[in-house]
């Protein structure tokens, strides 16, 4: 092996370099010293390093490592943060439009039910929003409350408009009768099925994105161990002690060091891969009754159909309820008052066909494609960091942690480091507690994503057919039956025009590699197209 170059007789170069790291401190020896107190940069001869310098190098090395890690994840982090914000806002917009469509349906078709209907609709969609954001609300209860509240108003305003105000105390009885007599047929159950499935999926999709951000934030701010600090110092700074200022570490050596330093982080890889693949599966299944946009924007139509169903049976209902709620305090309604031929009218649901342009689902698929390019993010981190820090190309004339070599030999490097500490031992240590915690969270979300993955083919609960629905002209899959389009209904020409309204507040100019981002006003649906340009 070549002899080491003659050391800097005055340590002048080392001093001027170190001055940049720690201005004004006189820790650099004037001339090379034996360095017997050094613990990391063990000298083979006179050295220009002191113990204090070594400590400073270790601190700097660990900071460098944290910065490299943060820059490695910047693109991925931005991708998930921006999409989480955009989707949350988009879902809010869907909810708002669904509420407005439903209110408009009441205003146009049943003005006598307003403003009470606005209240029930408003409360329902408020709960929908809260549920999506993670509130502990039961979807079936939300739907039941909507219909429980609606029926007394339908009964008193539509079916018996002449009822005096004094009869308002029958409301409680009417609420109970609504369920017992199934006055809306199977529409409440249909809505429960559609809303619960679509909202559950939406909620877990948002949860998964937010967990993705948490994973990146956790690994972004990892504090590296002292052992790792020593390895990094040896790789990046010990050459300076010998006056070798321009020497770069060997590439192979860098990989070994990084794998040692990042052994814990790399353990995330398996669960991260599963996370992205499970998220992809979830997204692939987010259509029809598993697509909140499709379900919620069609709700006004299903609610309209449910009220028409009540009106069809108004005569029989009025008679039955007249008996049931005559003495409302007793609330003695029972099946004895329930004529068997009531409510057997089978409802044929019609599809509200929608002309899709730029949809949330295409936006979701686009996100998954981008995320898949980061599927090996954690396993590739050591290599990525080495390729983004100074290393010698082709391992020629490079630093192996102890000396300048012509070619890097992992075996020689390991042998040479035996007395300092064992690289293998470092790799065998378990992951840090924070990494273990994030792995547990990933396992949990992966489990949820797997259980949420939708069955292929016939998705709607089969028992809906048995309870009075026919597929009719709905097509082959019952889950297409999102609702009809009664007279005076709002035509949902394009479900997704509203996406033009979507404005997100992340400072897009700060996006890495993105300087010409259009604003959402530049074209009607630019928000989503432009997002595709952000990496």
């Amino acid at each position: 092996q070549p002899p080491p170059p003659p050391p800097d007789a005055t340590c002048h170069q080392v001093r001027s370099f170190f001055q940049r790291l720690q201005p004004g401190l006189k820790w650099v020896p004037e001339t090379p010293v034996p360095g017997s107190d050094l613990q990391v940069c063990l000298p083979k001869g006179p050295t220009c390093c002191s113990r204090k310098m070594e400590e400073k190098y270790q601190l700097t090395a660990r900071l460098n490592m944290e910065q490299l890690l943060q820059s490695a994840s910047m693109e991925l982090k931005f991708l998930i943060i921006q999409n989480a914000a955009v989707f949350q806002e988009a879902f809010e917009i869907v909810v708002r439009h669904a509420k407005n469509y439903t209110n408009a349906m009441f205003k146009n078709n049943y003005p006598s039910l307003t403003p009470q209907a606005f209240e029930f609709v408003g409360e329902f969609f408020t709960d929908v929003s809260l549920y999506i954001l993670g509130s502990d609300i039961n979807v079936d209860d939300m739907v039941n409350e909507l219909f429980d509240s609606l029926f007394p108003v339908i009964y008193t305003q539509l079916m018996n408009p002449g009822l005096p105000d004094s009869a308002l105390d029958i409301n409680e009885c009417l609420r109970g009768a609504r369920r017992d007599l199934k006055v809306f047929g199977n529409f409440p159950k249909l809505i429960m099925t559609q809303v619960s499935k679509s909202l559950q999926v939406t909620r877990i999709f948002l949860q998964a994105l937010n967990l993705g951000i948490e994973v990146i934030n956790t690994t972004d701010h990892l504090k590296f161990s002292k052992d790792c600090g020593r390895m990094l110092t040896r790789m990046w700074y010990c050459s300076y002690c010998q006056g070798l200022m321009m020497v770069k570490p060997c590439g192979g050596y860098c990989n070994v060091v990084m794998q040692g330093c990042m052994a814990g982080v790399v353990e995330i890889d398996k669960y991260w891969r599963e996370y992205i693949l499970s998220l992809e599966e979830l997204v692939n299944g987010m259509y029809r009754i598993y697509d909140m946009e499709n379900v919620l924007l069609g709700l006004f139509s299903t609610i309209h159909d449910s009220i028409q169903y009540v009106q069809k049976n108004a005569g029989k209902l009025t008679t039955t309820i007249g008996k049931l709620c005559a003495h409302s305090q007793q609330r003695q309604y029972r099946s004895a008052y329930y004529p068997e031929d009531l409510f057997i009218d089978k409802k044929v649901l019609k599809v509200a066909h929608v002309e899709h342009e730029e949809t949330l689902s295409s936006r979701r698929r686009e996100l998954i494609q981008k995320l898949k390019s980061f599927i090996s993010f954690y396993s590739a981190l050591p290599g990525y960091i080495c390729s983004h820090s100074p290393v010698a190309e082709n391992d020629t004339l490079c630093w192996n942690g102890q000396e300048l070599v012509e070619r890097y030999s992992q075996k020689a490097a390991r042998n040479g480091m035996k007395n300092q500490f064992n690289l293998h031992e470092l790799k065998m240590k378990g992951p840090e507690p924070v990494v273990s915690q994030i792995i547990d969270k990933l396992k949990h979300i992966n489990q949820l994503l797997r259980t949420m993955s939708m069955p292929k083919g016939r998705v709607l609960d089969k028992n809906l057919d048995e309870e009075g629905f026919e597929s009719g002209d709905c097509g082959d899959d019952e889950d297409e039956c999102i609702g009809g389009s009664g007279d005076g209904m709002i035509k949902v020409k394009n479900q997704l025009r509203f996406l033009a309204e979507l404005a997100y507040d992340l400072d897009v100019d700060d996006a890495p590699g993105n300087s010409q981002q259009a604003t959402p006003k530049d074209n009607e649906i630019s928000t989503f197209h432009n997002l595709g340009n952000v990496h």
């Epitope: 809010e92 708002r96 403003p115 209240e119 609709v121 408003g122 409360e123 509240s149 007394p152 105000d165």
Partner: antibody, heavy 119, light 107 residues
Framework: QVQLVQSGGGLVQPGGSLRLSCAAS????????MNWVRQAPGKGLEWVSY????????KYADSVKGRFTISRDNAKKSLYLQMNSLRDEDTAVYFC????????????WGQGTMVTVSS | EIVLTQSPATLSLSPGERATLSCRAS??????LAWYQQKPGQAPRLLIY???NRATGIPARFSGSGSGTDFTLTISSLEPEDFAVYYC?????????FGQGTKVEIK
Amino acid sequence: QVQLVQSGGGLVQPGGSLRLSCAASGFTFSHYTMNWVRQAPGKGLEWVSYINSGRSTIKYADSVKGRFTISRDNAKKSLYLQMNSLRDEDTAVYFCARWEWEQEAFDIWGQGTMVTVSS
Amino acid sequence: EIVLTQSPATLSLSPGERATLSCRASQSVSSYLAWYQQKPGQAPRLLIYDASNRATGIPARFSGSGSGTDFTLTISSLEPEDFAVYYCQQRSNWPPTFGQGTKVEIK
């Protein structure tokens, strides 16, 4: 004309109780969600409580939960706020306000009534 | 809960001038934002709902804009009766919250 007329404010010692009333006229009271909103002297507005038309949904701000009770009598077109275990920080002007669900806003307000909690 | 921050705290202007009041939410509130005017000793009065719709009887000089987290109330030409405190309020998330208010005073 649509209006909300309030009564029942006054001076009360810490730990004491007070009942506020709000009488509605000019609109079908039983069709609307009603609220109480308060404003401490020289401060901003703070939502306190909410009751929907059929009394099936009732909500409270964390600061008053367990101490205040909202209720309504649709036949009497009246809204009430029963305030127990009053604290100094409950000192404020209390407004009753109608919530308009289509607009998603408080569209009609009472004139306000002062509640002073002091020993 | 969502925090609404209004700026400036005080705006000193002369009648006829244009007033621009800002309201920023700590997270997106979509367009569920309303603006109220309150004069001393009076109850608040609804001016704008759903970020940009004028309430019944509100003069055209009042206009609202914005969505997501940034909202603006503009009074195109101040009238003497417009000098008051203005509050923004969100209903996107429970509970409904108000901003701390912007006082528009005569310069």
